[in-house]
Interface confidence: low
């Protein structure tokens, strides 16, 4: 003897990403010689048994048996969200509800507010915005592999009344190590299923030069050829180098090249050499003390910087 529940259809709630496909499945144990029917939130019949009732090519029959009616809706739009009803026309009519939730996919975030020509110790503020999410997405910031703590995500309803625009800003003080770094804004949302949707802004930081003097070869001997490389670092790269030898007036040489060449080392070349590397951000002077000894022993040489 069948219980009343055996004629009660059952279904389940479904969540689908906008543009995706959702399958609505309705089952019943005892159909009492009646057909199952699906209708949409506007109470329009979609399928009655295997018969299509609504002319919408997105809606297709998946399974129609006395005990099951399954349909698929492809290219789901936000407007398709709502309660779908499965009915069986027994006495009395029995229904089951399937709540279809459509997720709005957030758009690729947009970063604004970057000002070029940032200088070391300047404060940078970047803004990030992403539209189209439902429910509202969350934004996170990072600099390279390091997380940046931006302000809490602001949420604003889109004009369609269904999706949201989220925005966040981050403020940080830049250092010379940040030159060339990527500031990344990522949007986190269940519709992305863990996929990364982010935008990066590479920043340029202008900073004062540094320099060091590198001898080539590292242990020069009398009679050898020696190059003193003044290795300038900075942004912009040093454009001008002033070489001078302590006690030598005027300075040895002003050059746009960073190397000082000794074609044939003499003892008289011994002394302390200074290289001033200059860019439009400032100057830096490096020192190198050269001791030219006899050809056989390895001469002592030292380098100091400030």
């Amino acid at each position: 003897n069948l219980s009343q529940d055996d004629s009660q259809p059952w279904t389940s709630d479904e969540t689908v990403v906008a543009g995706g496909t959702v399958v609505l499945k309705c089952q019943v144990k005892d159909h009492e010689d009646s057909s199952l029917q699906w209708s949409n939130p506007a109470q329009q019949t979609l399928y009655f048994g295997e018969k299509r009732a609504l002319r919408d090519n997105r809606i297709q029959l998946v399974t129609s048996t006395p005990h099951e009616l399954s349909i698929s809706i492809s290219n789901v739009a936000l407007a398709d969200e709502g309660e779908y009803t499965c009915s069986i026309f027994t006495m009395p009519v029995r229904t089951a509800k399937s709540l279809v939730t459509v997720l709005g996919i957030p758009q690729k975030p947009i970063i604004t507010g970057y000002k070029s020509s940032l200088r070391e110790k300047d404060t940078a503020t970047l803004n990030c915005q992403s539209s189209g999410s439902k429910p509202a997405a969350r934004l996170t910031w990072r600099k390279g592999d390091q997380e940046l703590h931006g302000e809490p995500t602001r949420i604003q309803e889109d004009p369609n009344g269904k999706t949201f625009t989220v925005s966040s800003s981050v403020t940080f003080q830049v250092t010379r190590e940040d030159d060339g770094a990527s500031i990344v804004c990522s949007v986190n949302h269940e519709s992305l299923k863990g996929a990364d949707r982010s935008t990066s802004q590479r920043i340029e930081v202008l900073y004062t030069p540094t320099a060091m003097i590198r001898p080539d070869p590292p242990h020069p001997r009398e009679g050898q050829k020696l190059l003193l490389h003044c290795e300038g670092r900075g942004n912009p790269v040093p454009q001008q180098y002033l070489w001078e030898k302590e006690g030598s007036v005027p300075p040895l040489k002003m050059t746009q090249e960073s190397a000082l060449i000794f074609p044939f080392l003499n003892k008289s070349d011994s002394g302390t050499y200074g290289c001033t590397a200059t860019s439009n951000m400032g100057s830096y002077k490096a020192y190198y003390t050269l001791n030219v000894n006899d050809p056989s022993p390895v001469p002592s040489s030292s380098s100091t910087y400030h």
Epitope: S116, S117, R202, E204, L206, L227, N235, P236, T255, Q256, E257, S258, A259, L260, I261, S279, N280
Partner: antibody, heavy 119, light 113 residues
């Protein structure tokens, strides 16, 4: 007339060596950075190496580092490219070119010299 | 290394018509301290060495006809020939000299339709 003329190309076996020369005339050679650029048959242009005006700064593409050496003799207005450990894929026309810092484009080119590496 | 990508690979244009060649760099070649784009355009005719047309992305080399112009900034650049002449048939290359190794685009072959 401002002119660059390359020489020294030819046929060489894999593993062999060649020295290319580039003779400059019509301008103050010692005031310009110089470059070597190559072009394999039917292919595009590929930068090889550069040398600063006084010869103290040199930079080369990774594919020639340790094999090719660029040098210059400002007294003779000559640019050189010493090519060692040559490989079949080094087969190309080799051009020397002038690179003025005020433009940073290569404004004067030689006619090129053909290097063929084959056994 | 900075990768330079030209489009199209080949182009056929009628005499007197406009020809446009695009060049994209994999990273910006704009140097903020002097606001210059380190990009040049060259023309190469069969059996000849390349000829410098444009440097700093938009400065015409002396002696180059004014129908040749360069534009763009950062990563996207364009060489335009406003009215194609028969002698413009050649392969055109863009090149960055922002950082070594200096790299060229793969070339665009320009023909007459």
């Amino acid at each position: 007339e401002v002119q660059l003329v390359e020489s020294g190309g030819g046929l060489v076996q894999p593993g062999g060596a060649l020295r290319l020369s580039c003779s400059a005339s019509g301008f103050t050679f010692s005031g310009y950075w110089m470059h070597w650029v190559r072009q394999a048959p039917g292919k595009g242009l590929e930068w090889v190496s550069q040398i600063s005006s006084s010869g103290t700064i040199i930079d080369s593409a990774d594919f020639v580092k340790g094999r090719f050496a660029v040098s210059r003799d400002n007294a003779k207005d000559l640019l050189y490219l010493q090519m060692n450990s040559l490989r079949a894929d080094d087969t190309a026309v080799y051009y020397c070119a002038r690179g003025p810092l005020a433009k940073n484009g290569f404004d004067i080119w030689g006619q090129g010299t053909m290097v063929t590496v084959s056994s | 290394d900075i990768v330079m990508t030209q489009s199209p690979d080949s182009l056929a244009v009628s005499l007197g018509e406009r020809a446009t060649i695009n060049c994209k760099s994999s990273q910006s070649v704009l140097y903020s301290s002097n606001n210059k784009n380190y990009l040049a355009w060259y023309q190469q005719k069969p059996g000849q060495p390349p000829k410098l047309l444009i440097y700093w992305a938009s400065t015409r080399e002396s002696g180059v006809p004014d129908r040749f112009s360069g534009s763009g900034s950062g990563t996207d650049f364009t060489l335009t020939i406003s009215s194609l002449q028969a002698e413009d048939v050649a392969v055109y290359y863009c090149q960055q000299y922002y950082s070594t190794p200096y790299t060229f685009g793969q070339g665009t072959k320009l023909e007459i339709k």
